[in-house]
Interface confidence: low
């Protein structure tokens, strides 16, 4: 594993995989990022999803002092989204197109989370909200919201790993 006993991760490997995640997250729903289809005054309903915030130690100083805080936060987020992408929200109707990148995105989230999971140590994972929309149209709306917040999350994670690879790699 990349973080045996809580040591530094394989920053370069993590950087490469997180960049791939960014690409996949954009291709999974390309219009989410560069165009805002909400109306003025719409509220973002992303309170339930993990965000990387100022106190999470993901700034350059925090990463230098103890990268584990930030890596734990990223790991929690990856597991959270991995569970969501494997849930009925994405597996139910309407079925994804056969060549949809969501499957690859799901696998890559799992791959990066495994890179960050220390051997024999299990970080607490955030509970995923019990979302079981009954209508296909509700699922689609949830997919958009999840992919929008996932794009933001992996963009920050990719910046963290790029910084780590450039400055913290042995």
């Amino acid at each position: 594993r990349a973080v045996p006993g809580g040591s530094s991760p394989a920053w370069t490997q993590c950087q490469q995989l997180s960049q791939k995640l960014c690409t996949l997250a954009w291709s999974a729903h390309p219009l989410v990022g560069h165009m805002d289809l909400r109306e003025e005054g719409d509220e973002e309903t992303t309170n339930d999803v993990p965000h990387i915030q100022c106190g999470d130690g993901c700034d350059p100083q925090g990463l230098r002092d103890n990268s584990q805080f930030c890596l734990q936060r990223i790991h929690q987020g990856l597991i959270f989204y991995e569970k969501l992408l494997g849930s009925d929200i994405f597996t139910g109707e309407p079925s994804l197109l056969p060549d949809s990148p969501v499957g690859q995105l799901h696998a890559s989230l799992l791959g990066l989370s495994q890179l960050l999971q220390p051997e024999g140590h299990h970080w607490e994972t955030q509970q995923i909200p019990s979302l079981s929309p009954s209508q296909p149209w509700q699922r689609l709306l949830l997919r958009f919201k999840i992919l929008r917040s996932l794009q933001a999350f992996v963009a920050v994670a990719a910046r963290v790993f790029a910084h780590g690879a450039a400055t913290l790699s042995p």
């Epitope: 805002d36 289809l37 909400r38 109306e39 309407p94 149209w137 689609l140 709306l141």
Partner: nanobody, 116 residues
Framework: EVQLVESGGGLVQPGGSLRLSCEAS?????????MYWVRQAPGKALEWVSA????????YYADSVKGRFTISRDNAKDTLYLQMNSLRSEDTGVYYC????????RGQGTQVTVSS
């Protein structure tokens, strides 16, 4: 069951116009959803053409159709429209209205053929 039904396609000469419609039936809240037009040219992948926000105040276009196509919607009629002007041969394809940009949830489509 929710259905999206497109109409208005046909054969038109280059430079001509068509107006596509898409009626959403059995959908109680059409106005809750941003809507898209996507198209598939013969032998090519599905591509998004245009998008419109829920109330219609925000509209977006692929570069290839900008200035020629206009998307609109009538939430009272649960209907989406695409006005296509100055049509070119490369606009030929099956046009679908969809609830997502990748066309996962879409209608059966309407054929547009631009040819002299």
């Amino acid at each position: 069951e929710v259905q999206l039904v497109e109409s208005g396609g046909g054969l038109v000469q280059p430079g001509g116009s068509l107006r596509l419609s898409c009626e959403a039936s059995a959908l109680t809240s059409f106005s809750n959803y941003a809507m898209y037009w996507v198209r598939q040219a013969p032998g090519k992948a599905l591509e998004w053409v245009s998008a419109i926000s829920r109330a219609g105040s925000n509209t977006y276009y692929a570069d290839s159709v900008k200035g020629r196509f206009t998307i609109s919607r009538d939430n009272a009629k649960d209907t989406l429209y695409l006005q296509m002007n100055s049509l070119r041969s490369e606009d030929t394809g099956v046009y679908y209205c969809a609830v997502d940009s990748s066309g996962t949830w879409r209608g059966q489509g309407t054929q547009v053929t631009v040819s002299s």
